[in-house]
Interface confidence: medium
């Protein structure tokens, strides 16, 4: 049976995708065939074939970026080290180990789902402007995050969420494969408005919040919290 695992990695970091037999296993590298490939597209990530040092069939996206340890393989550890993780690496990877002496029987089969994440920049909320006498518009921008974010606007007076019908979000996939988001909030003009923009990265369980107040050009201090929006700002660490 195929074992299933999940692992999380930050964009730009290195990650190990685990594929290993129980401790105490011993393998002969002249007997074992190891294949790492992506599950859906069958892209060849790397492989070990006895008496074949050439990796000519490795996809260009993974050449020199995906390695197994020969010393580890002797111990039954066929884990893949993937360097400089990119958003495009977010997929399922399959490790298949076959033994020639066992008639090319499958010895190990592991599927590892790689989830990729990147922190969004601290949101920037523009000073409100008035397209009409009875309306205020705020713009919130945050860039270079992954995966696709959720954007919430908050009434800072009572920490309630504003109606999402009042906001218009545009999410761009930038040149690096990361997400940029621009959210425009339109609300009725009131004498004093104290609102915040919150960018939620679900995978990192992270919220970045920045406030803006009418009558005060200087926004509140930026905040980051590991809690969902609805819990307010308990345990918030202040960014300087």
């Amino acid at each position: 049976d195929t074992q299933e695992k999940e692992v999380r990695a930050m964009v730009g970091s290195d990650v190990e995708l685990s594929c290993a037999c129980p401790e105490g296993s011993r393998f002969d590298l002249n007997d074992v065939y190891v294949y790492w490939q992506t599950s859906e597209s069958k892209t060849v990530v790397t492989y070990h074939i006895p008496q074949n040092s050439s990796l000519e069939n490795v996809d260009s996206r993974y050449r020199n970026r995906a390695l197994m340890s020969p010393a580890g393989m002797l111990r039954g550890d066929f884990s893949l080290r993937l360097f400089n993780v990119t958003p495009q690496d977010e997929q399922k990877f399959h490790c298949l180990v076959l033994s020639q002496s066992l008639g090319f029987q499958e010895v190990l089969s592991v599927e590892v789902t790689l989830h990729v994440a990147a922190n969004f920049s601290v949101p920037v909320v523009s000073a409100p402007h008035s397209p009409s006498q009875d309306e205020l518009t705020f713009t919130c921008t945050s860039i270079n995050g992954y995966p696709r974010p959720n954007v919430y606007w908050i009434n800072k007076t009572d920490n309630s969420l504003l109606d999402q019908a009042l906001q218009n979000d545009t999410v761009f996939l930038n040149m690096r494969g990361l997400y940029d988001v621009v959210s425009v909030l339109r609300i009725a003009r009131t004498p004093s408005v104290n609102i915040g923009c919150c960018i939620e990265n679900v995978l990192l369980q992270q919220n970045l919040t920045v406030g803006s107040q009418t009558g005060n050009d200087i926004g509140e201090r930026d905040k980051i919290t590991e809690n969902p929006v609805s819990t307010g700002e308990k345990n918030a660490a202040t960014w300087s």
């Epitope: 195929t2 065939y33 294949y35 490939q37 069958k42 060849v44 492989y47 074939i49 006895p50 008496q51 074949n52 069939n57 399959h94 298949l96 076959l98 020639q100 090319f104 499958e106 089969s109």
Partner: nanobody, 118 residues
Framework: EVQLVESGGGLVQAGGSLRLSCAAS????????MDWYRQAPGKERELVAT???????NYADSVKGRFIVSRDNAKNILYLQMNSLKPDDTAVYYC????????????WGQGTQVTVSS
């Protein structure tokens, strides 16, 4: 897209020979472990022969010494030379690329019929 196309089957007398071919596309053929399977009427599909990218082979006991599996990595073709055929060898013969389907047999061609008459 993966394609495996078998050919070379036919009707042959017991004791005769046939050579089956399997043309593969859409796979990294030279690194794939390739198999020949067969399925006789009313029976389970069974593994007949296996060959690695480097040419290492493995055979079912029932065909050892009679069948020879080989491959041409330059042309992406898998072969099965069948000698001293017996009526028991009558079946539809299929090839399979092992790595592509996690060691399980999912990508089948249409197969090629081999009938051995006594």
């Amino acid at each position: 897209e993966v394609q495996l196309v078998e050919s070379g089957g036919g009707l042959v007398q017991a004791g005769g020979s046939l050579r089956l071919s399997c043309a593969a596309s859409g796979i990294a053929f030279s690194i794939d472990i390739m198999d020949w399977y067969r399925q006789a009427p009313g029976k389970e599909r069974e593994l007949v022969a296996t060959i690695s990218g480097g040419g290492s082979t493995n055979y079912a006991d029932s065909v050892k010494g009679r069948f020879i599996v080989s491959r041409d990595n330059a042309k992406n073709i898998l072969y099965l030379q069948m000698n001293s055929l017996k009526p028991d060898d009558t079946a539809v013969y299929y090839c399979n690329a092992r790595r592509l389907i996690y060691g399980r047999t999912v990508y089948w061609g249409q197969g090629t019929q081999v009938t051995v008459s006594s």
